[in-house]
Interface confidence: medium
């Protein structure tokens, strides 16, 4: 018996089609994935193959100003229309809070969304029970699947499920449930979820009676020959691994941002076990045509965006410097804005310990593209944001020694004066520079805020400790010349869209007056350029 | 600007063995780690080693078991020993760190 598994992950509100790497769409002959483009694709396999279920794995939440307007009606509105089979609970899920979730997409889904470490309690227990899942059977063609859902346990750190939802380990809490399926003579199981690839890999070995899994959050790129476009695989696809039964478990994650549709074919003996499986992502480039009714249901919903992009967040009283000649070479007011909105949209009270479990902020001068002129009545619209921060990136979470983080500042001013765009803006943290020393021994002086404290202060940098540390993924994925962040960085979790951070933290204070107040100094007098 | 200079290449026998050493002007190792790169005549620059600031080792398929990267932080260099040396090894060595490149040290391996 032949079952066809499509699956996304982390497509972070990628409803329209994007470009080549997942920014706006600029030049549409180019342009790649989005729902309508989508739903061809899927149609096209639907019409071709009997057995075939799509399957979503996480964060379809957060990315995009269709977020920020529709908070995730969009994402029920149009996974209903594309008929999904079966979705796992991200960690981006949670960014509005557990109402956030329930109003616009538990309640509205007709699809089953699923979590099987993930336990309510208190009075939410009784308000959430029955819009997810531990599990679900679904009938397909004649036979049955068993679908298991699994959340990252880190959801607490990474967003807002509030305090009555308890985050399982995911192998601790996905063997029973699968033990369930099995004596309800369901021999085909998939784990469905939102861990990682790590994680994937290891339920796959550790977790008895799964013969597939589909996984998100790490945005892993699996491919078996040449690569159709930019992404570089993390290894074949599926990517097999022998379960300590001694099974070939089938694990697969299709990048992010809608840019390709997972495709795996599994062959299944009468006892439920994988005898082949075989696929490959598929691209949605422009040779897909966006289909038409999708399409127009998108047109429809686009409007509402474009008003909003106008609309007052807040005001400022100050001016916005977000100039090159400033960011790229001091201290500017428009970094600390941002690192500072970095830094509140990551508040989490989890541990009576820490007033915070992160207080650090860095971020590429170069990432700021625009000042906020603030004789324009004060007022600063989603569309001013949008020019200063153009690349639709997000402010992620990484963990890194103090040794790297020391690198990353003596990069910062390794080349000090060309105006280049890996001199850093900061949060959490106060750096002297002597430029009159060689590159690579410039850092003087760099002291960082304490979490674990009650009245924050700052301390000295330690080189063997473990810091927790909010920036752009360019950051963490090395660019601007970070190579020493991607290559030393202990873990990385993916964030929040750049711009909904910002507009989040300026429609909240209201009035914003950011100053330049001395996180970044130079000794000998060197700040001039 | 940064200054790269590799030294240690030469003319050796099939089967014999080579220490390339990098010397870095600026205490850059310890930023950006270093790798060693080689080019045969007519081929592209492919990479031979890489070693991370925090020591981590990558080897390209063809040398791995043969050659060893090794970096001295407090001199600012990096080596590559290279052991049973072939033909196909011949090129012309080259030191990189971050945008840096040295002008490339010369190893021939004859049969």
């Known amino acids: 018996w032949e079952l066809t598994i499509l699956h996304t992950n982390d497509v972070h509100s990628r409803l329209e089609q994007t470009s080549e790497d997942s920014s706006k769409c600029v030049n549409a002959s180019r342009c790649m994935g989005g729902v309508a483009r989508l739903f061809t694709k899927v149609q096209q396999i639907r019409r071709a193959e009997p057995n075939v279920l799509l399957l979503d794995a996480g964060d379809q939440y957060q990315g995009t100003i269709w977020f920020t307007v529709y908070k995730g009606a969009e994402v029920a509105h149009f996974m209903n229309a594309l008929r999904y089979d079966a979705m796992a609970l991200g960690n981006h899920e949670f960014d509005n809070g557990v109402e956030g979730l329930i109003e616009p997409l538990l309640k509205e889904a007709k699809f089953p969304i699923l979590s099987a470490n993930i336990k309510a309690k208190g009075p939410l227990a009784s308000q959430i029970s029955g819009l997810y899942l531990p599990y679900k059977v679904l009938p397909v063609g004649d036979e049955v699947v068993g679908i298991v859902g699994y959340t990252s346990k880190e959801t607490p750190f990474l967003s807002n499920p509030g305090t009555n939802l308890v985050f399982e380990d995911e192998i601790t809490a996905l063997q029973p449930e699968v033990d369930k399926l099995k004596t309800l003579n369901v021999n085909k199981i998939i784990a469905l979820g939102h861990s990682g690839f790590e994680m994937d890999k290891l339920i796959a070995q550790k977790v008895r009676g799964v013969d597939v899994v589909v996984g998100g959050h790490s945005n892993t790129f699996l491919y078996t020959g040449n690569p159709p476009s930019k992404e570089v695989p993390a290894g074949k696809y599926p990517f097999i691994v022998t379960s300590d039964d001694g099974r070939k478990v089938p694990v697969v994650q299709a990048y992010a941002f809608g840019k390709y549709l997972g495709y795996l074919k599994i062959e299944f003996d009468e006892r439920g076990n994988v005898i082949s499986s075989h696929g490959n992502p598929i691209l949605l480039n422009s040779s897909i045509p966006e289909d038409p009714s999708i399409k127009a249901d998108i047109n429809k919903w686009r409007i509402k965006l474009d008003n909003y992009s106008t609309q007052e967040l807040g005001k400022t009283i100050v001016y916005l410097d977000g100039s090159s000649q400033s960011c790229r070479f001091r201290e500017c007011n428009m970094g600390n804005l941002i690192c500072d909105a970095m830094i509140n949209n990551n508040l989490r009270h989890t541990d009576e310990m820490f007033w915070n479990h992160v207080s650090m902020c860095i971020l590429n001068g170069g990432g700021i593209r625009s000042p906020i002129d603030e004789r324009n009545n004060g007022t600063i619209t989603w569309e001013n944001l949008a020019a200063v921060l153009p690349f639709g990136g997000t402010f992620d979470l990484v963990q890194l020694k103090g040794s790297t983080l020391k690198k990353a500042f003596e990069h910062s001013v390794h080349r000090y004066g060309q105006s280049t765009g890996e001199f850093l803006q900061v949060g959490g943290i106060h750096v002297v520079y002597d430029l009159s020393r060689k590159p690579g021994d410039r850092v003087v002086k760099l002291d960082v805020l304490c979490t674990k404290c009650r009245v924050p202060s700052y301390d000295p940098l330690k080189m063997d400790e473990v810091y927790k540390v909010i920036l752009p993924n360019f950051l963490a994925n090395g660019g601007d010349g970070f190579q020493m962040i991607k290559d030393e960085l202990l873990r990385h979790d993916s964030g929040d869209q750049d711009i909904n951070v910002v507009s989040t933290y300026i429609s909240k204070m209201k009035v914003i007056y950011p100053a330049v107040e001395g996180r970044i100094k130079f000794s000998h007098h060197h700040h001039h350029h | 600007q940064v200054q790269l200079q590799e030294s240690g290449g030469g003319l050796v026998q099939a089967g014999g063995s080579l220490r390339l050493s990098c010397a870095a002007s600026?205490?850059?190792?310890?930023?950006?780690?270093m790798g060693w790169y080689r080019q045969a005549p007519g081929k592209l620059r492919d990479l031979v080693a890489k070693i991370t600031s925090g020591g981590r080792t990558t080897y390209a398929d063809s040398v791995k078991g043969r050659f060893t990267i090794s970096g001295d932080n407090a001199k600012n260099t990096v080596y590559l020993q290279m052991n049973s040396l072939k033909p196909e090894d011949t090129a012309v060595y080259y030191c990189?760190?971050?945008?840096?490149w040295g002008q490339g040290t010369q190893v021939t391996v004859s049969s």
């Open positions: 600026e205490n850059i190792f310890n930023i950006y780690g």
């Open positions: 990189n760190s971050y945008y840096y």
